[in-house]
């Protein structure tokens, strides 16, 4: 059945800027988005923006920009003015309608530092891009490996050299390791029936937003398709819920906001799938 | 408190339309969808179509091939359901609906209008 | 269009029982919605999006199902459960309704 995951996410670079997140699982071409704040729209919440696949987007303060990242996805920027950050403790509500089948909304909030069940407050977390973190490593094992045979040289001048191997270990992959299975207690904490696949992939490359979310097939005309098999839900990043349709919160564990440019994580090996079979495309 | 007034009751000929309204009330009117459906005497449900309040935009069941007309006002908070071209089967109680949304974590609530009866009798 | 076929037709049951009705779509459908309807009332949404239920509806109700076949089912009967019960889909236009299961009581 339809879901809708709604992800909030604090900017690396100033912390006064804040992106939502949202997207939406299910048959059917989407014919409206509505993002609100402060609770669901049309139940107290108060819209920031509204995007329509043909006409455009309209946006209120404090939204700054609101854009389709993918036929199924939205993205909204909020620029918080003040001095202290209200948007820290604020729900936000994404609200997908697929006309006339029926509307599905799901909220999210960005998780206080405080929460037990996170490990580090919503900063910037410095992950190193895997060709950097291999010239790194490579780099730190030939300073290394000069620093050892100068060494070995002084003390021994007539010892032969010693071999070395650059290690290329991936920074990201070993993230990600430490990362999923926290994902799936979380998952167990929220909800008893969720099943999460913590099995380790590896990063897809090339297939992603600089932003870090995956980039999936757009078309231009609308096509609608019946109905297929449920797609596997992306791991989404920091404070992401997903929205399932037994009324409880899963959330979806926890991921540094920037992984870097390239670099799309997924609870299979498989990718995104089933994208163009399941949603009738802009 | 949300509420959706119906007009009253009807009596028509075979051939002729009949116009029911809907005003809504309680809530944002363009916020929710309404849908109609009727319920002949004794009978089951039929769901006659939807409308997006928002932008007008209409899906019909086909059964009625272009014979029903959703219309709305947001002026006055009103939609609107024609039915042209009225036969005796057309008699029944007709309803309109504010169409539910699903939102996690949140009440899913339905509302109805109280029902409009077309009687079509020559 | 989807066809919804309900059974039985007539439930007879005593208040404490427990009542299932069953609603076979004619091709598969991604989710049932079920509403309970009172003589001289209009319908009330009861379960949407095949096991949710909506806001107010006691928890002795409860939905299951998938593809082709859906259920509903009372847990114990109060005296204010008999009444009429439609399944509806909405996966295909044009929407439909089950023909409907009368609960009454024995």
């Known amino acids: 059945t339809p879901e809708v995951w709604v992800q909030v996410q604090m900017e690396a670079t100033e912390l006064s800027s804040f992106t939502v997140h949202c997207g939406f699982l299910g048959p059917g071409s989407i014919s409206l988005v509505t993002v609100s704040w402060g609770g669901p729209d049309g139940a107290g919440g108060t819209k920031l923006a509204v995007l329509h696949p043909e006409l455009g987007t309209r946006q209120w303060a404090p939204a700054r920009q609101a854009r389709w990242e993918t036929q199924s996805s939205i993205s909204l920027a909020l620029e918080d003015s003040g001095a202290s950050s209200p948007f820290a403790n604020t729900t936000f509500c994404c609200k997908f309608a697929s006309f006339p089948e029926g509307s599905w909304e799901s909220c999210g909030s960005l998780p206080p530092s405080s929460d037990p069940g996170l490990s580090a407050p919503p900063t910037p977390v410095p992950i190193l891009r895997a060709d950097l973190a291999g010239i790194l490593g490579l780099s730190g094992v030939l300073l290394f490996g000069c620093g050892y045979l100068l060494h070995l040289l002084r003390r021994q001048k007539h010892r032969p050299t010693p071999r070395l191997q650059p290690s290329h270990t991936n920074s990201q992959a070993l993230t990600a390791q430490a990362w999923a299975p926290s994902q799936a207690s979380q998952a167990a904490l929220h909800d008893p029936y969720a099943t999460i696949n913590t099995s380790f992939c590896p990063a897809t490359l090339d297939t992603a937003h600089p932003n870090g979310w995956a980039s999936l097939p757009t078309h231009a005309a609308h096509q609608p398709q019946g109905p297929a098999a449920s797609a596997s839900t992306p791991i989404l990043a920091r404070g992401s819920f997903v929205s399932v349709e037994n009324g409880l919160y899963t959330q979806a564990g926890e991921r540094p906001p920037h992984t870097g440019p390239g670099l799309t994580l997924f609870p299979d090996c498989r990718g995104p799938r089933a994208v163009e079979g399941r949603f009738g495309v802009r | 408190e949300v509420q959706l007034v119906q007009s009253g009751a009807e009596v028509k000929k075979p051939g002729a339309s009949v116009k029911v309204s809907c005003k809504a009330s309680?809530?944002?009117?363009?916020?929710?969808?309404i849908y109609w459906v009727r319920q002949a005497p004794g009978q089951g449900l039929e769901w006659m179509g939807t409308?997006?309040?928002?932008?007008?935009?209409?899906s019909y069941n086909q059964k009625f091939r272009g014979r029903v007309t959703m219309t709305r006002d947001t002026s006055t908070s009103t939609v609107y359901m024609e039915l042209s071209s009225l036969r005796s089967e057309d008699t029944a109680v007709y309803y309109c609906?504010?169409?539910?949304?699903?939102?996690?974590?949140?009440?899913?609530?339905?509302?109805w209008g109280q029902g409009t009866l077309v009687t079509v009798s020559s | 269009q989807i066809v919804l076929t309900q059974s039985p037709a007539t439930l007879s049951l005593s208040p404490g029982e427990r009542a299932t009705l069953s609603c076979s779509a004619g091709?598969?459908?991604?989710?049932m919605h079920w509403f309970q309807q009172k003589p001289g009332q209009a319908p009330r949404l009861l379960i949407y999006?095949?096991?949710n239920l909506a806001s107010g509806v006691p928890a002795r109700f409860s939905g299951s199902g998938s593809g082709t076949d859906y259920t509903l089912t009372i847990s114990s009967l109060e005296p204010e459960d008999f009444a009429v019960y439609y399944c509806?889909?909405?996966?295909?236009?044009?929407?439909?309704f089950g023909q409907g299961t009368k609960l009454e009581i024995k």
């Open positions: 091709s598969s459908v991604n989710y």
């Open positions: 999006s095949t096991s």
């Open positions: 309680g809530y944002t009117f363009t916020d929710y969808w």
């Open positions: 409308i997006d309040t928002s932008d007008h935009k209409t």
């Open positions: 609906a504010r169409d539910f949304i699903i939102t996690v974590n949140y009440p899913v609530v339905d509302y």
């Open positions: 509806q889909q909405r996966s295909s236009l044009p929407f439909t």
